[in-house]
Interface confidence: low
């Protein structure tokens, strides 16, 4: 009943199986991999999306850190454990009983350990820095036009409240989008910045998660904005705990 009624699909998540078996024969959609019912009027959580995507090839990358506590997703894809609300469980383990703690966007924030490893709470990622490099254009984009277009995109496509887009920085050809959302700021029904950032990342790669919508066509005053590379940095409300060996 959360999906488009006529053809029973999930507008916000194509990685679903939908059927008219909800109350009163209404359309109901379940995420691939987990079988969890999803709310098709908003973004699906990153945890459920990663679980659904597990058949995709591994995607590891090494990034430069902008601050000592920033995290990057170097581990690539894994099959996560999600809680009943679709959020990442604080402790993740693989089939060989290697475990680690993750933050609210599913990025590892501790050294890997064994089954005795404790992760007391799911630490919230409250600041995400999306670093983009755009392809050469005739001239630089107008900063205020670029800012307005990116804010519009996050509001209209990803349904993220404008107050959570903290800043858009631009020094040709680098664009930085800062998303900030503290636990205290996030009200019931708010899209999570981690989910919005993940949908944006997939859109930029040409792997849109939306059902039937065309790919992302970003334009600033009619000029196409084509992204060459994307780096995403995650800052947690509590700094990560890695051994000194990893930091050197």
């Amino acid at each position: 009943h959360t999906a488009a009624q006529d053809n029973c699909t999930c507008p916000t998540n194509k990685m679903t199986v939908c059927s008219p078996d909800g109350p009163g024969g209404r359309c109901q959609c379940r995420a691939l991999g987990s079988g969890m019912a999803v709310d098709c009027s908003t973004l699906t959580s990153k945890c459920l999306l990663l679980k659904a995507r597990m058949s995709a090839p591994k995607n590891a990358r090494t990034l430069v850190r902008p601050s000592e506590h920033a995290l990057v997703d170097n581990d690539g894809l894994y099959d996560p454990d999600c809680d009943p609300e679709g959020r990442f469980k604080a402790r993740q383990c693989n089939q060989t009983s290697v475990c680690w703690c993750v933050n609210s966007v599913g990025v590892r924030r501790t050294d890997k350990g064994d089954l005795s490893l404790r992760c007391d709470e799911l630490v919230r990622t409250h600041h995400i820095l999306i670093d983009l490099r755009h392809r050469p254009t005739a001239g630089a984009f107008n900063h205020s036009d670029l800012d307005a277009e990116l804010r519009r995109l996050f509001r209209e496509r990803y349904r993220l409240h404008p107050k959570f887009v903290a800043a858009v920085h631009y020094e040709q050809p680098t664009i930085q989008i800062e998303l900030r959302q503290n636990t205290s700021q996030k009200a019931a029904g708010d899209v999570d910045i981690g989910d919005a950032a993940y949908y944006f990342e997939r859109d930029i790669k040409g792997e849109s998660l939306f059902q039937g919508r065309g790919g992302l066509d970003l334009r600033v005053r009619g000029e196409p904005l084509q992204v060459e590379r994307t780096l995403i940095y995650y800052l947690d409300e509590i700094p990560p705990k890695f051994s000194m060996k990893r930091l050197t």
């Epitope: 959360t2 009624q5 209404r26 359309c27 908003t42 349904r159 409240h161 009200a187 708010d190």
Partner: antibody, heavy 121, light 107 residues
């Protein structure tokens, strides 16, 4: 239970201003936008604007931007709308209504009973 | 601004009938449409949000559907107390806008 309380009526002169109040109870005031909606007799509903009680961020319908001022008093969980330069067009029921912060939730799940504003000399 | 159009200002029905009210958005609003019922002298009451979600406590004879620009609100079996005005609203972007309303009356 969740309630938005508004005074029943206000009688004002043309050209004057009026300040309408809306007292929230039964929920966390700062967890929702407070919206104001106008309804003229036998007509549709018109969104005037909204305010975030946390930081008093406001969004206005352009049509009302120059004449409506939205404020909140967090201590008393009360929202206010001041309308200036009143004309007969402002004779209407003015409702306050709450909505969630996420854009998926920009519908109005709780409404006040409305204040009937009558502009007359 | 997104304009919401309800093609019928009045609709005639009988008790026990199935009736559908339509609402059209001037641009794509995804599933961000809500439906309200308003009885004379009362404030509007939320029935449906996000196109097809029934609000808490709303009887299951009320349903909504649609995506993009075309939306439908359906009462599966009209009761006497349902004969009143229904408004649609887009909750996709500001300024938030409403349809002009459709009055359901007895045939």
């Amino acid at each position: 239970q969740v309630q938005l309380q508004q005074p029943g009526a206000e009688l004002v002169r043309p050209g004057a201003s009026v300040k309408l109040s809306c007292r929230a109870s039964g929920y966390t005031f700062t967890n929702y936008w407070m919206n104001w909606v106008k309804q003229r007799p036998e007509q549709g509903l018109e969104w005037i604007g909204r305010i975030d009680p946390n930081d008093s961020e406001t969004h206005y319908n352009q049509k009302f931007k120059d004449r409506a001022i939205l404020t909140v008093d967090k201590a008393s969980n009360t929202a206010y709308m001041q309308l200036s330069g009143l004309t007969s067009e402002d004779s209407a029921v003015h409702y306050c209504a709450r909505s969630g912060f996420g854009s998926t939730y920009w519908f109005f799940d709780v409404w006040g009973a409305g204040t009937t504003v009558t502009v007359s000399s | 601004d997104i304009v919401m159009t309800q093609s019928h200002k009045f609709m005639s029905t009988s008790v026990g009938d199935r009736v559908s009210i339509t609402c059209k958005a001037s641009q794509d609003v995804s599933t961000a449409v809500a439906w309200y019922q308003q009885k004379p002298g009362q404030s509007p009451k939320l029935l449906i949000y996000s196109a097809s979600y029934r609000y808490t406590g709303v009887p299951d004879r009320f349903a909504g559907s649609g995506y993009g620009t075309d939306f439908t609100f359906t009462i599966s079996s009209v009761q006497t107390e349902d004969l009143t005005v229904y408004h649609c609203q887009q909750h996709y972007s500001t300024p938030l806008t409403f349809g002009p309303g459709t009055r359901l009356e007895l045939k």
